[in-house]
Interface confidence: low
């Protein structure tokens, strides 16, 4: 059947060094288990991530995401999921498009990354 | 605006083959892909390409259609071969890609394969 993919409506913040989650579900919800969930680099579509046949397809990685990257799939049961970035460079920062297929069937979802430096954020007086 | 320019679709026999092309001007595509729709039928995907190069196929189509791509000229073609009846339909382009800072999703008109038994 059909369905729709939705991203988080707002940008997800992280900062450099830390973890970021972008999540993504389908609409309406329903068992996501067989089918397979991919996240592009937009927007030149270099693969973060790849989950197929039910297994982490790492082969098909971009390289600067191998190692670093975790598909969370406790709720895949009701269409939900959300890419674990590990190490979040500068870099990372960007549009993400993530897609489900059904057999015949796809859509995607965009999802925007911010990342921030971590030093920024200290208050000048608490070095004085 | 993204406009998309569908072009090579027509009539043939069963066995024959032909080759649907789609255009598109004022964005670069994230993933262009081409569904189809027989009479009756939801709309269906026949093959999906992302601008990375990855692509995917309805398992009615694979081994007979192939997709390629050109994110420069933001151009995708269908390759398709071995055709029969079954795969009669309006095919539509579709493009997906960041426009102007969104997301956003575009259709072609639709152009008609008929095959012919």
């Known amino acids: 059947g059909q369905f729709r993919v939705i991203g988080p409506g707002h940008p997800i913040r992280a900062l450099v060094g830390d973890e970021a989650e972008l999540p993504c579900r389908i609409s309406p919800g329903k068992n996501a288990t067989g089918m397979e969930v991919g996240w592009y680099r937009s927007p030149f579509s270099r693969v973060v991530h790849l989950y197929r046949n039910g297994k982490d397809q790492d082969a098909e990685q971009a390289p600067e995401y191998r190692g670093r990257t975790e598909l969370l799939k406790e709720s895949i049961g009701e269409g939900k999921v959300a890419l674990r970035i590990q190490n979040v460079r500068f870099s990372d920062e960007g549009g993400y498009t993530c897609f489900f297929r059904d057999h015949s069937y796809q859509e995607e979802a965009a999802v925007e990354l911010k990342v921030e430096d971590p030093f920024y954020w200290i208050n000048p007086g608490v070095l004085a | 605006q993204v406009q998309l320019v569908e072009s090579g679709g027509g009539l043939v026999q069963t066995g024959g083959s032909l080759r649907l092309s789609c255009a598109a001007s004022g964005s670069m595509f994230s993933t262009m892909g081409w569904f189809r729709q027989a009479p009756g039928n939801q709309r269906e995907l026949v093959a999906i390409?992302?601008?990375?190069?990855?692509?995917n196929y309805a398992d009615s189509v694979k081994g007979r259609f192939t997709i390629s791509g050109d994110n420069v000229k933001n151009t995708v073609t269908l390759q398709m071969n071995s055709l029969n009846p079954e795969d009669t339909a309006v095919y539509y382009c579709r493009f997906t890609g960041w426009v102007k800072s969104s997301f956003s999703t575009y259709w072609g008109q639709g152009t008609q394969v008929t095959v012919s038994s």
């Open positions: 390409m992302s601008s990375g190069g990855t692509a």
